[in-house]
């Protein structure tokens, strides 16, 4: 008698390794014997797929090689025109060993930055992944974290993070491990020990000691009066990291000496200054009973800053003013080449004024400094970021020279416009067109840990100033 | 000596408009900086404009931006706000104020000289 | 828009009394901070500029301090004809705001 068809066993979940072969059964009871179809996620697997082999008048289907795709529900359908279709289904789920899809590389890194090693990875169950620094398990902490996709997340890469790493992919089926990967860490650099100023007697021997440290070591090169140094000799050696240079000088003239660390990341360069003045004793003493005179402005640096045939006053404490003042704004102006476009025209303006005051001739020459007000704009607006380098640098005394208490002034110790309009001299060139004012360097709470200024930021100013107010 | 003087308020309807004047003297308008100051009957100071008329620069307060127009004249040592489609929140008494300096230090040196006010009543 | 947020908005006081009023700044500022005392039907006098700088003509028992993003104007012993309304303000380039205001009344 014709018999609907009844499936006597149900299609149950099958787990399958990849490259294994899985099977369902779809065992069928029917007269007339059944036709029986076969779907993945409904779609009609074809009887001609090479990748499947259908037995048993269609009861058995054979996935022949497991690939990671072939996860899904499979359902078998009997039908033999007798009653209706009956269908049974059940799922494969894929297994699958360990395997790092995306290992991690060799990287280097500047100290303080944030270091991101990849460890991407496949498998089922899904893999746990742990990191290995040298023969250790790397514990995570504060700093160090192992992210969802199981990359490796070092925040303020310190020197101790540099090593050998490798991630470690487990689950049930098995484990993979990377390939060893190296972290190194480079780091600015930075000088240790600044040479000292010295004044000394006319043919005396000096020796000047500057000692920096960075990854990779610096090297160190001396500068005199903002150029190399022509003569004297340098010694020069390096032990743990840390390069050790000493300048031996005959003094026969008074200087400006700048020892200048540098080293390389990638393509850039990093650097540290110290400077520090040598003096000749009898060269400093002052001439006659006042502190300078008036004389109109010949030098080159500060031509564009100063008004034309500006009257400043020349310190007669220097052996020669005119030579003297000139060079300390000239190592001084050379300084502000790393500074931001914003800061640039105005700290050179608040230099030149503030080493070249302008002068009130009279029976007592006397120096006009900069107003109070004016130093606070080229301070807190201009060259907020700036100034705090240069004050952190000036405290921890890597500022040693007279160039640099000549060229920060204090601005709380100058004279306020309110007090006298005479008393004080307002500062030129404090204005900059619509396109160079976008915004202004935020003003920082905390001084930066990096002792190089930053560019004026691109996001809107925690200074108050905005980036919407209108110039017309 | 230092001293401002502004003039120009009066009654106007919403919607309307009013120029007020302020006539420095004791300095030089192109050397410092100008403001404009008004207080609502009862309230706080509010700022409205600034210029610096050495840069030419101004700037409003988002309130009146687009209304309002600051501008000096140096030949006269005056400067000006002109106040267009008027509304009854800019009734107040407007002040005209100078601090030394462009644009950047003027903060720093302060509003050191004050006009007596003018009243502006906007009502229908 | 940077708020500065004025307090007390009054206070009452006797003469020689300390008397202190507080500026806190929304966000980062510079120290282009005045301090300005209004009489009614009157218009304000400047007393501290630049935070901490007192005005020409002022008397010594004023005096403003910063700590931050605080401002703080101090009269250190209140005279009958202090009592008035004092406003702080803040200066950007330009972006110029001022305090709610404190009243200083007689207790």
């Known amino acids: 008698l014709p018999k609907a068809p009844v499936i006597t066993t149900p299609l149950e979940t099958v787990d399958a390794l990849v490259e294994e072969v899985a099977t369902f059964m779809c065992a069928v009871e029917s007269y007339p014997q059944p036709e029986i179809s076969w779907t993945r996620n409904k779609i009609l697997i074809k009887l001609f797929d090479t990748r499947y082999s259908i037995r048993e008048n269609g009861q058995l289907l054979t996935i022949l090689s497991v690939e990671d795709s072939d996860d899904g529900i499979y359902c078998c359908t009997a039908n033999n025109g007798v009653g209706g279709a009956v269908e049974s289904c059940g799922a494969l789920q894929v297994k699958m060993k360990p395997k790092i899809t995306r290992p991690p590389i060799n990287v280097k890194i500047i100290e303080g930055l944030k270091a991101v090693l990849p460890c991407t990875t496949m498998g089922n169950p899904k893999p746990s992944v742990s990191w290995i620094k040298g023969d250790s398990p790397l514990r995570e902490n504060s700093r160090i974290a192992v992210l969802e996709s199981g990359s490796l997340r070092i925040h303020n890469v310190q020197k101790e993070d540099a090593g050998q790493y490798r991630c470690v992919a487990k689950n049930s089926l098995g484990t993979a491990y990377s390939k060893v990967v190296k972290l190194e860490v480079e780091v600015f650099a930075r000088i240790l020990r600044a040479p000292e100023s010295h004044n000394v007697t006319f043919g005396s021997f000096v020796t000047l000691h500057c000692t920096a440290t960075g990854i990779p070591v610096p090297t160190i090169t001396w500068i005199e009066n903002g150029n190399a140094v022509s003569s004297g000799s340098i010694q020069e050696s390096v032990k743990d990291r840390v390069i050790d240079s000493r300048l031996q000088l005959f003094i026969t003239k008074p200087g400006l000496y700048t020892c200048i660390a540098t080293n390389k990341h990638g393509e850039k360069f990093s650097t540290a200054k110290a400077a520090a003045t040598i003096s000749i004793a009898e060269w400093s003493k002052p001439q006659k009973d006042n502190k300078g005179y008036c004389a109109q402005y010949r030098g080159e640096v500060c031509n564009a800053v100063l008004a034309k045939d500006a009257l400043v006053f020349l310190n007669t404490s220097y052996a020669d003013p005119e030579e003297a003042q000139e060079l300390l704004v000239h190592t001084a102006w050379n300084e502000l080449k790393v500074v931001s476009p914003v800061c640039r025209p105005a700290a050179e303006a608040l230099l030149c004024n503030h080493i070249f005051q302008e002068c009130s001739p009279g029976v007592v020459p006397t120096p006009i400094p900069i107003c109070r007000e004016y130093c606070l704009a080229v301070k807190e607006l201009f060259c907020a970021k700036e100034w705090l380098v240069m004050e952190e640098k000036t405290h921890r005394g890597l500022y040693r020279s007279e160039m640099h208490l000549l060229s920060v002034p204090e601005c709380s110790k100058l004279p306020s416009m309110h007090w006298d309009p005479t008393a004080c001299a307002r500062l030129p060139h404090l204005d900059y067109n619509k396109e160079n004012l976008k915004t202004f360097p935020p003003m920082t709470s905390s001084k930066p840990s990096v002792d190089i200024p930053n560019l004026p930021s691109s996001s809107s100013s925690s200074f108050s100033v905005s980036p919407t107010y209108s110039m017309t | 000596e230092v001293q401002l003087v502004e003039s120009g308020g009066g009654l106007v309807q919403p919607g309307g408009s009013l120029r007020l004047s302020c006539a420095a003297s004791?300095?030089?308008?192109?050397?410092?900086?100008i403001h404009w100051v008004r207080q609502a009957p009862g309230k706080g100071l509010e700022w409205v404009a600034s210029?610096?008329?050495?840069?030419?620069?101004?700037s409003y307060a988002d309130s009146v931006k687009g209304r309002f127009t600051i501008s000096a004249d140096t030949s006269k040592n005056t400067a000006y706000l002109q106040m267009n489609s008027l509304r009854a929140e800019d009734t107040a008494v407007y002040y005209c104020?100078?601090?030394?300096?462009?644009?950047?230090?003027?903060?720093?040196?302060?509003?050191?000289?004050w006009g007596q006010g003018t009243l502006v009543t906007v009502s229908s | 828009d940077i708020q500065m947020t004025q307090s007390p908005s009054s206070l009452s006081a006797s003469v020689g009394d300390r008397v202190t009023i507080t500026c806190r700044a929304s966000?980062?500022?510079?120290?282009?901070v005045a301090w300005y005392q209004q009489k009614p039907g009157k218009a304000p006098k400047l007393l501290i500029y630049?935070?901490?700088s007192l005005y020409s003509g002022v008397p010594s028992r004023f005096s403003g301090s910063r700590s931050g993003t605080d401002f703080t104007l101090t009269i250190s012993s209140l005279q009958p004809e202090d009592f008035a309304t004092y406003y702080c303000?803040?200066?950007?380039?330009?972006?110029?705001?001022f305090g709610q205001g404190t009243k200083v009344e007689i207790k």
């Open positions: 210029i610096s008329s050495s840069y030419g620069s101004t």
């Open positions: 630049s935070a901490s």
């Open positions: 966000q980062s500022v510079s120290s282009a």
């Open positions: 104020a100078r601090s030394e300096g462009d644009r950047y230090v003027s903060g720093y040196s302060g509003m050191d000289y």
């Open positions: 004791g300095f030089t308008v192109s050397s410092s900086s």
């Open positions: 303000q803040q200066s950007g380039v330009w972006l110029i705001t």
